[in-house]
């Protein structure tokens, strides 16, 4: 699948920061999503998890960005083997973990798809 260019990663990082900065109230009314393995294929896995959250404008741009990073079409209810299917976490925690790992990838120039 396509590897996100560094500019696209930068835009994702900036958006993840935008929706978490100084945020203490639960994102998306405290919705829970499946945790994922932050490894190769993480963008598709992240999208598969977040796409099940509907009606949350705060993460709509993130969902669109992730869909651009994922080579296949993802729809609600679709899960890959990349999910740690026994753990659900709050959207805010999920976004924070995704941000932290995406920054690591950006710093080290490893843009896994």
């Amino acid at each position: 699948g396509p590897v996100p260019p560094s500019t696209a990663l930068r835009e994702l990082i900036e958006e993840l920061v935008n929706i978490t900065q100084n945020q203490k109230a639960p994102l998306c009314n405290g919705s829970m999503v499946w945790s994922i393995n932050l490894t190769a294929g993480m963008y598709c896995a992240a999208l598969e998890s977040l796409i099940n959250v509907s009606g949350c404008s705060a993460i709509e741009k993130t969902q669109r960005m992730l869909s651009g990073f994922c080579p296949h079409k993802v729809s609600a209810g679709q899960f890959s083997s990349l999910h740690v299917r026994d753990t659900k976490i709050e959207v805010a925690h999920f976004i924070t973990k995704l941000l932290s790992y995406t920054k690591q990838l950006f710093r080290h120039g490893q843009q896994f798809n």
């Epitope: 930068r10 900036e14 935008n18 900065q21 203490k24 920054k103």
Partner: antibody, heavy 126, light 109 residues
Framework: EVQLVESGGGLVKPGGSLRLSCAAS????????MSWVRQAPGKGLEWVGR??????????NYAAPVKGRFTISRDDSKNTLYLQMNSLKTEDTAVYYC?????????????????WGQGTTVTVSS | SYELTQPPSVSVSPGQTARITCSGD??????AYWYQQKSGQAPVLVIY???KRPSGIPERFSGSSSGTMATLTISGAQVEDEADYYC???????????FGGGTKLTVLG
């Protein structure tokens, strides 16, 4: 020692320009979001603007009274923050502080740490 | 533009509890930060993210938040706590910072 040292203040005429600098040491400046805060004589603190770390986008935000006139920039290779002030007005007269931005502390490696400079005085008068 | 509202002054006797409030429409979703500024000095962070205390700040300083109001509490105020106190937060976007007008704390010695 963790510190910020501002310089570049002085007396300038209305409509003039000035560039303030803030030299950082003792912490990882490149990971820090940085702010400028000012305090007019006998008044309270006023947020001027901030710049994110490069990894977090390097974007800037400004308070309404200075937007379009002031520009915040950074040079991570020199551990230095800048505030370019154009079209200065008498109401811009204040002590200007640079500081680590607490909102950005969550993303940097200075969480729970607070660093302010000693301030540099800018006087706008004819 | 977004505003944070503080009382101009609060007075207590030494050993009493001082409470300084800060109100703002975005505070239910955005953290508050509190700074102490003594005359002629740069501000010092005493509380971050509503209720966390930086290292080196005495335990008598605490913070809380409920709804649109954040509160700085100084339990057993001391003469050296006399200073101006400012709350700081952001607008609902998180992009624009704002300070309250400041509260002058007087500890009647």
């Amino acid at each position: 020692e963790v510190q910020l040292v501002e310089s570049g203040g002085g007396l300038v005429k209305p409509g003039g320009s000035l560039r303030l600098s803030c030299a950082a040491s003792g912490f990882t400046f490149s990971n820090a979001w940085m702010s400028w805060v000012r305090q007019a004589p006998g008044k309270g603190l006023e947020w001027v603007g901030r710049i994110r770390s490069e990894i977090d986008g390097g974007t800037t935000n400004y308070a309404a009274p200075v937007k379009g006139r002031f520009t915040i920039s950074r040079d991570d290779s020199k551990n230095t923050l800048y505030l370019q002030m154009n079209s200065l007005k008498t109401e811009d007269t204040a002590v200007y502080y640079c500081a680590t931005d607490q909102v950005g502390a969550y993303y940097g490696d200075y969480y729970g740490m607070d660093v302010w400079g000693q301030g540099t005085t800018v006087t706008v008068s004819s | 533009s977004y505003e944070l509202t503080q009382p101009p002054s609060v007075s207590v006797s030494p050993g009493q509890t001082a409470r300084i409030t800060c109100s703002g429409d975005a505070l239910p979703e955005k953290y508050a930060y509190w700074y102490q500024q003594k005359s002629g000095q740069a501000p010092v962070l005493v509380i971050y993210e509503d209720s966390k205390r930086p290292s080196g700040i005495p335990e008598r300083f605490s913070g809380s938040s409920s709804g649109t109001m954040a509160t700085l509490t100084i339990s057993g105020a001391q003469v050296e706590d006399e200073a101006d106190y400012y709350c700081h937060s952001t607008d609902s976007s998180g992009n624009h910072g704002v300070f309250g007008g400041g509260t002058k704390l007087t500890v009647l010695g």
